[in-house]
């Protein structure tokens, strides 16, 4: 399987909420001995590999923000810790998973990575990730709502988030 990032860039005004999204593509094994570990973290555009370094999102580590579930299940974080930081990660039945960040500030700008680990029989792991940029803007040049830009593999016309 692969991870797709429907949007590679999110441009948002300060104070707005945003939901960053990743999607699992390809055959997803829903067998009894297969589980998925999904999480989010900040990173930097490394010289060798994007998303290699794992930095916290609003002081929460990738471990704090994880979802862990069977192949056919949906899940979301109910952690008080995440919600106290204005964060919530969620996953649905269709391979979509997301992190919602509330009340954005300029400090939230940066590169965000989603990570999926497929675990088979507890001793085989397949790891994939996706990356996207968040730009939080303030002042007269800031958009009134978040504007999202599709990844290059999709239609390049920008779409305004609802």
């Amino acid at each position: 399987f692969k991870v797709a990032t429907p949007y590679s860039l999110y441009v948002c005004p300060e104070g707005q909420n945003v939901t960053l999204t990743c999607r699992l593509l390809g055959p997803v094994d829903k067998g009894h001995d297969v589980t998925f570990y999904k999480t989010w973290y900040r990173s930097s555009r490394g010289e060798v590999q994007t998303c290699s370094e794992r930095r916290p999102i609003r002081n929460l580590t990738f471990q704090d923000l994880h979802l862990h579930h069977g192949g056919h299940q949906a899940a979301n974080t109910s952690h008080d810790l995440a919600q106290r930081h204005g964060l919530e990660s969620a996953s649905d039945h269709h391979g979509n998973f997301s992190i919602t960040m509330r009340n954005l500030t300029l400090l939230d700008s940066g590169l965000y990575c989603c990570l999926v680990v497929e675990i088979r029989h507890h001793h085989s792991e397949h790891r994939v990730h996706g990356a996207m940029e968040l730009q939080v803007q303030t002042g007269k040049d800031a958009p009134s709502n978040c504007v999202v830009y599709p990844s290059s593999s999709q239609d390049s016309e920008n779409i305004t988030a609802a």
Epitope: Y37, S52, Q63, H68, H122, H123
Partner: antibody, heavy 118, light 106 residues
Framework: QVQLVQSGAEVKKPGASVKISCKAS????????MNWVRQAPGQGLEWIGL????????SYAQKFQGRATLTVDTSTSTAYMELSSLRSEDTAVYYC???????????WGQGTLVTVSS | EIVLTQSPATLSLSPGERVTMSCSAS?????MYWYQQKPGQAPRLLIY???NLASGVPARFSGSGSGTDYTLTISSMEPEDFAVYYC?????????FGQGTKLEIK
């Protein structure tokens, strides 16, 4: 803060069994695998196996298959490792360590010394 | 089983020296992890995913490599760095460690 606190040292006779506990606190127990690693005196690290508190699934190194048994009690956030048919070469410090999937063992217990001697 | 071979087994150094140690895998691995262990203590995670510093690890430590050959470098030895260093792989079951490289004071 994250803590893994292991039970105390044990002295056992050859052929006996030992059960070591590892009590976790300061993190979501079911979001990690609990791994067990041993270190014989003056030797390197040897991975024994892991258990997922999320679903109880286990995986063992071939060498320990059938002799080591890993269990968890999620109500107390405690992991256990039982090793049976002990022999003198099982004398070692046994560590528990947590590991997030796709990551490394980032927190370790203080270790439990098991001495097997007749 | 993937066998990890560390070299050298022992290195005698002085504080301030640069040190490089290697870890060679018997078959290709995706990522390498490095741990430091001092006498009487549990191991401590230093490097994850080949080249990234774990939380609280000083910037004098760095990791690199790919495939079967990986390296841990300490740019300038501090007195607290004298310890045993282990590489470890999670790419293939069973999860194995190298035999360790001991750094001792010259």
């Amino acid at each position: 803060q994250v803590q893994l606190v292991q039970s105390g040292a044990e002295v056992k006779k050859p052929g006996a069994s030992v059960k070591i506990s590892c009590k976790a606190s300061g993190f979501s127990f079911t979001g990690y695998t609990m791994n067990w690693v041993r270190q014989a005196p003056g030797q390197g690290l040897e991975w024994i196996g892991l258990i997922s508190p999320y679903d109880g699934g286990t995986s063992y190194a071939q060498k320990f298959q059938g002799r080591a048994t890993l269990t968890v009690d999620t109500s107390t956030s405690t992991a256990y490792m039982e090793l049976s048919s002990l022999r003198s070469e099982d004398t070692a410090v046994y560590y528990c360590a947590r590991r997030a999937y796709g990551y490394a063992m980032d927190y370790w217990g203080q270790g439990t010394l098991v001495t097997v001697s007749s | 089983e993937i066998v990890l071979t560390q070299s050298p087994a022992t290195l005698s150094l002085s504080p301030g020296e640069r040190v490089t140690m290697s870890c060679s895998a018997s078959s290709s691995v995706s990522y390498m992890y490095w741990y430091q262990q001092k006498p009487g203590q549990a191991p401590r995670l230093l490097i994850y995913d080949t080249s990234n510093l774990a939380s609280g690890v000083p910037a004098r430590f760095s990791g690199s490599g790919s495939g079967t050959d990986y390296t841990l470098t300490i740019s300038s030895m501090e007195p607290e760095d004298f310890a045993v260093y282990y590489c470890q792989q999670w790419s293939s079951y069973p999860f194995t460690f190298g035999q360790g490289t001991k750094l001792e004071i010259k």
